[in-house]
């Protein structure tokens, strides 16, 4: 699985979209985790609603929000008020039983706002523009994207 590199500006929001085969992953909850070291475990940051059909509802842990469109096969993670310490390697996961299948690996890079070091004068950014989709440096082919789950179902809690 290739790694997608996303860049976001410090203080802004970075939105990550992981696409997956909706029918293959039928019934499964999704999660966003942070990789601890290159070979280390992936520490869960946030997972989707415990009830599969309510996965479209946003779930938050601190400044990270997750929501899953289970029909379209897109899980969206928003990292709000991005900080330098948020930089690192993450995974979108599909949960089944006690196992987690990696849907996509994402390297988050945080760029310092150049205006922080200058007199910004009267320059301002409207509230609506403060969500940054991220500069996608390298896009990986994540899993097969046919609209198409082992069936190991995942609704309620996690594995």
């Amino acid at each position: 699985l290739n790694t997608t590199v996303l860049q976001g500006m410090a203080g802004q929001s970075l939105r990550v979209s992981c696409t997956y085969d909706a029918l293959k992953h039928w019934g499964r909850r999704k999660a966003w985790c942070r990789q601890l070291g290159e070979e280390g475990p992936c520490q869960r940051v946030v997972s989707t609603h415990g009830v599969w059909l309510l996965a479209f509802l946003k779930k938050r842990n601190g400044s990270t929000v997750i929501a899953d469109d289970t029909l379209a096969g897109t899980v969206t993670i928003t990292l709000k008020n991005l900080q330098a310490g948020d930089a690192g390697l993450y995974q979108c996961q599909s949960l089944r039983g006690r196992e987690a299948e990696v849907l996509q690996k994402v390297l988050v890079e945080v760029l310092e706002d150049p205006l922080d070091d200058q007199d910004a004068g009267d320059l301002w950014v409207p509230e609506e523009s403060s969500s940054f989709e991220g500069a996608q440096v390298e896009h990986s082919t994540s899993r097969n994207q046919e609209t198409s789950f082992p069936p190991t179902s995942h609704h309620h809690h996690h594995h």
Epitope: L23, G27, W52, G97, E146, P151, T152, S153, H156
Partner: antibody, heavy 125, light 107 residues
Framework: EVQLVQSGAEVKKPGESLKISCKGS????????IGWVRQMPGKGLEWMGI????????RYSPSFQGQVTISADKSISTAYLQWSSLKASDTAMYYC??????????????????WGQGTTVTVSS | DIQMTQSPSSLSASVGDRVTITCRAS??????LGWYQQKPGKAPKLLIY???SLQSGVPSRFSGSGSGTDFTLTISSLQPEDFATYYC?????????FGQGTKLEIK
């Protein structure tokens, strides 16, 4: 009609190779997990593994990992189970089955809702 | 692997009887469990999915219950065609695993 049709009975000698098939029709084969189940004579059902033909994702039971190979050709809606070197203990009935998708309450579930008729494999010297 | 223990392994009953078969998982599997019926020389047939939901076309005398580790299949009033072997299957975790089966025989 939604169905899985398996290849015919096989009689083989120990050490020989074999590949049996399971052809789906009446549904979108590539978007369903397909499982394989063994039933030795007079015994219960044993789950061998599954494949998702859409991207060839395969999961084996540890009991069968390295003993058999599961594969699929999505262009002809067919899943396969193969052995490179048969043993007498492989004598059994083998079933393929589709994992149907269900919604119950607010959860998404699976059940093996469509089964092949079974393929009898006999291994004897 | 998750072990599924079915009991009893065999059961003699009469037409009209109420019969209960149980399945216990070695660890919690939520409600990711199905029940299957198999008659001699035939492929298994799905009766119940999600522990308690009746598969389309299956008579309402069959019902399932349970969650976590303990599950039950009940046949409220046995009919002649119900004499068969019944299996539970967990599909919460890989590898999916069957119970060893319960053979239901005519008394």
């Amino acid at each position: 009609e939604v169905q899985l049709v398996q290849s015919g009975a096989e009689v083989k000698k120990p050490g020989e190779s074999l590949k049996i098939s399971c052809k789906g029709s009446g549904f979108s084969f590539n978007t369903y997990w397909i499982g394989w189940v063994r039933q030795m004579p007079g015994k219960g059902l044993e789950w061998m593994g599954i494949i998702y033909p859409g991207d060839q994702d395969i999961r084996y039971s540890p009991s069968f990992q390295g003993q058999v190979t599961i594969s699929a050709d999505k262009s002809i809606s067919t899943a396969y189970l193969q052995w490179s070197s048969l043993k007498a203990s492989d004598t059994a009935m083998y079933y393929c089955a589709r994992y149907g998708r269900y919604i119950y309450g607010y959860g998404g579930y699976h059940g093996m809702d469509v089964w092949g008729q079974g393929t009898t494999v006999t291994v004897s010297s | 692997d998750i072990q599924m223990t079915q009991s009893p392994s065999s059961l003699s009953a009469s037409v009209g009887d109420r019969v209960t078969i149980t399945c216990r998982a070695s660890q919690a599997i939520r409600d990711d469990l199905g029940w299957y019926q198999q008659k001699p020389g035939k492929a298994p047939k799905l009766l119940i999915y999600a522990a308690s939901s009746l598969q389309s076309g299956v008579p309402s005398r069959f019902s399932g219950s349970g969650s976590g580790t303990d599950f039950t299949l009940t046949i409220s009033s046995l009919q002649p065609e119900d004499f068969a072997t019944y299996y539970c299957l967990q599909n919460y975790n890989y590898p999916h695993t069957f119970g060893q089966g319960t053979k239901l025989e005519i008394k």
